[in-house]
């Protein structure tokens, strides 16, 4: 059971979803061990709380790792008010938190 730091990816909402009036930004953590990981969302460097949802996979039978997704959900109007979207990940396999981000409209 070797410690394994997560690979972290951030995904902006799709154009199709934005047309429906909502925006989901997804932070994906892949192949980490142990299971305990923290995801914090920042929008234009302001910490977000209460508007995200997490789900974690069962332990992988081959390598004993986990994956987790955290979804930040906003209205399209709120999403378009801001520019920088970031998720910050804390895990025992990381010596310091890892942040992945994107600038709205540039990806």
């Amino acid at each position: 059971r070797t410690v394994a730091a997560p690979s972290v990816f951030i995904f902006p909402p799709s154009d199709e979803q934005l047309k429906s009036g909502t925006a989901s930004v997804v932070c994906l953590l892949n192949n980490f061990y142990p299971r305990e990981a923290k995801v914090q969302w920042k929008v234009d460097n302001a910490l977000q709380s209460g508007n995200s949802q997490e789900s974690v996979t069962e332990q992988d039978s081959k390598d004993s790792t986990y994956s987790l997704s955290s979804t930040l959900t906003l209205s399209k109007a709120d999403y378009e008010k801001h520019k920088v979207y970031a998720c910050e990940v804390t895990h025992q396999g990381l010596s310091s938190p890892v942040t992945k981000s994107f600038n709205r409209g540039e990806c």
């Epitope: 059971r1 070797t2 410690v3 061990y33 142990p34 299971r35 305990e36 990981a37 923290k38 995801v39 914090q40 709380s49 209460g50 995200s52 949802q53 997490e54 789900s55 974690v56 955290s70 804390t90 025992q92 938190p97």
Partner: antibody, heavy 119, light 107 residues
Framework: DVQLQESGPGLVNPSQSLSLTCTVT?????????WNWIRQFPGNKLEWMGY???????SYNPSLKSRISITRDTSKNQFFLQLNSVATEDTATYYC????????????WGAGTTVTVSS | DIQMTQSPASLSASVGETVTITCRAS??????LTWYLQKQGKSPQLLVN???TLAEGVPSRFSGSGSGSQFSLKINSLQPEDFGTYYC?????????FGGGTKLEIK
Amino acid sequence: DVQLQESGPGLVNPSQSLSLTCTVTGYSITGDYAWNWIRQFPGNKLEWMGYISYSGLTSYNPSLKSRISITRDTSKNQFFLQLNSVATEDTATYYCTSFYYGYWYFDVWGAGTTVTVSS
Amino acid sequence: DIQMTQSPASLSASVGETVTITCRASENIYSFLTWYLQKQGKSPQLLVNNAKTLAEGVPSRFSGSGSGSQFSLKINSLQPEDFGTYYCQHHYGTPYTFGGGTKLEIK
């Protein structure tokens, strides 16, 4: 400062469910902590039972998985333990405790509440 | 599950003496080990985290060492308030497990 306080019945009948509440003050349970239950048996052995995280994810000790449920009420800043089908071996002092993501160890403990399972 | 084995189970010492308690993990837990002291009728209190970092307010006569699977807690110049039961616990993946405790009594 985070403070935790356990509450619940001190006596539970065998085969019934044990239900305990942990009230958290000084910090929101949707913050950066995982909220745990640990019990200490009469012989002093400590057993981690499970946690509910800041986001509502749960993790349980496999030895209890079929009997345990940890839930929360964010509006009251409380989390709960339910242990089903209790037996005399579940007699213990039950502690709620927390760890901060990034530190991982139990830094804050409640005073504990003693539960006796007996008819 | 990771098994934590503490030794000795009990220990009798005098004020001013130096004592060492050891803790062995059944597998590699890196430095994810915590030491607690529990006094009669009280909750465990944090002493040392990450194998060697003293918790806030813990006197410097306490020191933790080790990594991997072998750890120790040393107490120099025992004071009356140091007597009680010491527990080690790993915080590397669930289920978190504790050692059986070392009861330190006044000789």
